[in-house]
Interface confidence: medium
């Protein structure tokens, strides 16, 4: 079995998590991709996903989460803006490939959000503000209902993260396995 590894991001409240998930270009470029949170002993919960098929360089926003799939570079960009302490937890990118199980992209992200704004070590204040200038999407992306049982064979360290979006149309506090991307007009 492939060893599951984590990479750690320590950020302050209000900052932006800005990460990339690399994938095999030819194989997965147009596949639907998702951002998930993994809670202790539970199945991964999908927080946001791209459209199906995934569009090139087309931002999809779910509350404070923005996904952008760069087909030409073989990477999915994930941003979580205006981070809150409650966002702390373990996250992963997956590629949906029905009827097969989702393909997990390495490595998992251990996000630690602490109180008090500081410009480091994440994106600086300007880039945190800029994130809201992304043109809103007018499409709905439906995230598949299933998650992979394989990804929880070994319970990760406990995380108490609840992703909440106080300033947006969608509240992710009580996340179910399916999340519909709202239409932003």
């Amino acid at each position: 079995a492939t060893k599951l590894t984590e990479e750690k991001y320590e950020l302050k409240e209000g900052q932006t998590l800005d990460v990339k998930c690399d994938y095999t270009l030819e194989k997965f470029a147009s596949s639907q991709k998702a951002w998930q949170i993994i809670r202790d002993g539970e199945m991964p919960k999908t927080l946001a996903c791209t459209e199906r098929p995934s569009k090139n360089s087309h931002p999809v926003q779910v509350g404070r989460i923005i996904l952008e799939d760069y087909h030409d570079h073989g990477l999915l960009r994930v941003r979580m803006v205006n981070l809150q302490v409650e966002d702390s937890g373990l996250y992963q990118c997956v590629i949906y490939q029905p009827p097969k199980e989702p393909h997990m992209l390495f490595d998992r992200i251990r996000l630690v959000v602490t109180k008090g704004f500081s410009g480091t070590p994440g994106s600086n204040e300007n880039s945190t503000q800029n994130v809201y200038k992304i043109p809103p999407t007018t499409t709905k992306a439906l995230c598949p209902l299933y998650t992979s049982p394989r990804t929880v064979t070994q319970a990760p360290p406990k995380s108490t993260a609840d992703v909440s979006t106080p300033d947006s149309e969608i509240n992710l506090t009580n996340v179910t396995d399916i999340i519909r991307v709202p239409v932003f007009n």
């Epitope: 590894t5 990479e7 750690k8 991001y9 998930c21 760069y70 960009r77 490595d107 992200i109 994440g122």
Partner: antibody, heavy 125, light 107 residues
Framework: QVQLVQSGAEVKKPGSSVKVSCKAS????????ISWVRQAPGQGLEWMGG????????NYAQQFQDRVTITADESTRTAYMELNSLKSEDTAVYYC??????????????????WGQGTTVTVSS | DIQMTQSPTSLSASVGDRVTITCRAS??????LAWYQQKPGKAPKSLIY???SLQSGVPSRFSGSGSGTDFTLTISSLQPEDFATYYC?????????FGGGTKVEIK
């Protein structure tokens, strides 16, 4: 094979600014992390910050946050590091270095595997 | 920030000697550790990544080990071109941090 070529040595007055460039030739530029590392005379290595050119957002070490700006121009495959309010303690060799993460990472799975030749910045009145 | 402590700060050795340099992280960094070699007036050169993986083109006499907080760089048989300063660096989390360096000198 990727190469990073940096701009030439600079002599600056205290209080002024310096902008060092780092041009990549060969290989992919956009999705690699370009970090800036400095080394004062006789001292160790100090990471200042880094950027993924495709994203355009930079990360900075806290001690440089207020004075440094890291940018990148995808069209010319060049990264820049601008340091403001220069002090004599900023006299150092400044290196750019490349990293690449195959996982969900801003930072380098392989460490900093390709380095520029270094740019000497001397701050003196 | 994660502090990286290298030891010794300097050592004297002869050609053919086995040399060991250690690096300790102030908190666990899994295997996210790299080792670099730097010669006077030159840019650092990457030797080891992910604690134990040899960078392409690096001689096999260099090896790395460890995980968590304690790491080791070993040169199995020191060669004349190996006299240099060696640095460890963590990339478990931002900001990336380096050890203070170990200078390997000729005895």
């Amino acid at each position: 094979q990727v190469q990073l070529v940096q701009s030439g040595a600079e002599v600056k007055k205290p209080g002024s600014s310096v902008k060092v460039s780092c041009k990549a030739s060969g290989g992919t530029f956009s999705i690699y992390v370009i970090s800036w590392v400095r080394q004062a005379p006789g001292q160790g290595l100090e990471w200042m910050g880094g950027i993924i050119p495709l994203f355009g957002t930079a990360n900075y070490a806290q001690q440089f946050q207020d004075r440094v700006t890291i940018t990148a121009d995808e069209s010319t495959r060049t990264a820049y590091m601008e340091l403001n309010s220069l002090k004599s303690e900023d006299t150092a060799v400044y290196y750019c270095a490349r990293g690449h993460g195959p996982g969900s990472s801003h930072y380098s799975y392989y460490g900093l595997d390709v380095w520029g030749q270094g740019t000497t910045v001397t701050v003196s009145s | 920030d994660i502090q990286m402590t290298q030891s010794p700060t300097s050592l004297s050795a002869s050609v053919g000697d086995r040399v060991t340099i250690t690096c300790r992280a102030s908190q666990g960094i899994s295997s996210w550790l790299a080792w670099y070699q730097q010669k006077p007036g030159k840019a650092p050169k990457s030797l080891i990544y992910a604690a134990s993986s040899l960078q392409s083109g690096v001689p096999s006499r260099f090896s790395g080990s460890g995980s968590g907080t304690d790491f080791t760089l070993t040169i199995s048989s020191l060669q004349p071109e190996d006299f240099a300063t060696y640095y460890c660096q963590q990339y478990n989390s931002y900001p990336l941090t380096f050890g203070g360096g170990t200078k390997v000198e000729i005895k």
